[in-house]
């Protein structure tokens, strides 16, 4: 009887995945002096070892531990920016506000950002044709488990005031099923984190509503308060102006509400 490989519902491994991970690692370690000691070949070997020859629906956080160890990085714990469903603006912000960090500004987040990968049980092959979809196939797939692992560690490292950027254009501004809602919120350490400050980003030009009163934001406040962490919320009515004012805080128009 011919053996047929499992056909998954999600897209296959990103093209040139091994080359991309290695190249990103080299680039990151060149730009960030504190990570110059990292051996990128060892990083790739550890990354590969987390999912190669393993069933792509049976990946665990333990599988990624060798990679986590190699990618250990200290970021200022009071300068962490989380985000949900608004990655591009969050990244634009940290590109300007250089002393703040999203997960994708760390080595491990940078390596995997926007990539998909999976292997096959009992073979050394990477699957370029299909990978498990989180909803349709399984949640313990290589990509989902990776982001769950690094997101948990990132949230655990946070201290003082933690910021989170949320998308005010979504029907659920705070979504309990997002990585932020299901992982990061629950791994902020109350003994280290004083406040979670949400920045709700407005989409429409004329949208002057107070989205901090949205029921899902109230739900977030309730979850955070129960964890003995204070909560605050700000509307960012004009994201374009917000970014401009981060670049040029002295600009006279930046004293008004953005």
């Amino acid at each position: 009887v011919p053996r047929w490989r499992q056909q998954w519902s999600g897209p296959g491994t990103t093209k040139r995945f091994p080359e991309t991970v290695l190249a990103r690692c080299v680039k990151y370690t060149e730009i960030h002096p504190e990570m110059r000691h990292v051996d990128c070949q060892s990083v790739w070997d550890a990354f590969k070892g987390a999912f190669i020859s393993k069933h792509p629906c049976n990946i665990t956080e333990e599988d990624y531990q060798p990679l986590m160890k190699l990618g250990t990085q200290t970021v200022p714990c009071n300068k962490i920016l989380l985000w949900s469903r608004i990655k591009d603006l969050a990244h634009q912000f940290t590109q300007v506000q250089r002393d703040m960090f999203t997960l994708e500004d760390t080595l491990l987040g940078y390596l995997a950002d926007d990539l998909t990968w999976c292997g096959e049980f009992n073979t050394s092959k990477i699957n370029y044709q299909s990978c498990p979809d989180w909803r349709k196939d399984c949640s313990n797939n290589p990509v989902s488990v990776f982001w769950k692992t690094v997101s948990r560690r990132f949230a655990e490292a946070a201290c003082d005031v933690v910021h989170v950027m949320l998308n005010g254009s979504r029907s659920k501004i705070f979504d309990k099923n997002s990585t932020f809602g299901s992982v990061e919120v629950h791994n902020l350490q109350p003994e280290k984190v004083q406040t979670l400050e949400a920045w709700v980003i407005h989409g429409g030009r004329e949208d002057s509503r107070d989205l901090c009163q949205d029921p899902t934001i109230k739900e977030l406040e309730s979850i955070i308060s129960k964890r003995n962490i204070q909560f605050s919320c700000k509307n960012i009515y004009r994201p374009d102006k917000f970014l401009q004012c981060v670049k040029n805080p002295e600009d006279s128009s930046c004293t008004s509400e953005i």
Epitope: P2, R3, W4, R5, Q6, Q7, S9, G10, P11, G12, K15, R16, F17, P18, E19, S124, K125, I126, Y128, Q129, S130
Partner: antibody, heavy 122, light 112 residues
């Protein structure tokens, strides 16, 4: 069973566009597992994979580097077929052209069209 | 891009065993599946081996595929040769772009 039926002209003038069509029966061009490929074969270049189209929530195309600047592979869901367009042809493009299905559960081609001999000549 | 190199031709007598190698020029052969196709004159290719060593239904078990990492090559072995096995055989693989590459083909002649 799955069958692929090719059609298109056998003679194309240099600098013009080569157009071939492959009609699918027994499967769907919009299948979430299969990919639909074009391959050509000539004495000088042997078998050469040219490109594919496939649907995974949206349409995707992949093209061989050797032809990527002049190839388009398009699905036609209404007719359950896919086509090859190769622009700016030269005599080097003279070959037998095949359409073929990659079923998705292995990296190979399990069903092939009958082949179309295309000559590029003035 | 990588290349897959095959001998131009091989010949063997009926009943014997023949092995056709396919050597990958760059990249590790074991990291990417290899397929084998049979093509008789004036016919379209037919897949006889996929995923290195799997036989599609309908292909006789006289056909087998293998991988040799030490030589970075794949092989197609046909045992108990029959005159109907006379054809061209092509290996095929891919790289991390999932672009496919075929070997140059090997003409198998069954003697006698």
């Amino acid at each position: 069973q799955v069958q692929l039926q090719q059609s298109g002209p056998g003679l194309v003038k240099p600098s013009q566009t080569l157009s071939l069509t492959c009609v699918i029966s027994g499967d769907s061009v919009s299948s979430n597992s299969a990919a639909w490929n074009w391959i050509r074969q000539s004495p000088s270049r042997g078998l050469e994979w040219l490109g594919r189209t496939y649907y995974r929530s949206k349409w995707h195309n992949d093209y061989a580097v050797s032809v990527e600047s002049r190839i388009i592979v398009n699905p036609d869901t209404s007719k359950n077929q896919f086509s090859l367009q190769l622009n700016s042809v030269t005599p080097e493009d003279t070959a037998v052209y095949y359409c073929a299905r990659d079923p998705g559960y292995f990296y190979g081609l399990d069903v092939w069209g009958q082949g179309t001999m295309v000559t590029v000549s003035s | 891009n990588f290349m897959l190199t095959q001998p131009h031709s091989v010949s063997e007598s009926p009943g014997k065993t023949v092995t056709i190698p396919c050597t990958r020029s760059s990249g590790t052969i074991a990291d990417y599946y290899v397929q084998w196709y049979q093509q008789r004159p004036d016919s379209s290719p037919i897949i006889v081996i996929y995923d290195d060593n799997q036989r599609p239904s309908g292909v006789p078990d006289r056909f087998s595929g293998s991988i040799d990492s030490s030589s970075n090559s794949a092989s197609l072995t046909i045992s108990g040769l029959k005159t109907e096995d006379e054809a061209a055989y092509y290996c095929q693989s891919y790289d991390s772009t999932n672009h496919w590459v075929f070997g140059g083909g090997t003409k198998l002649t069954v003697l006698g």
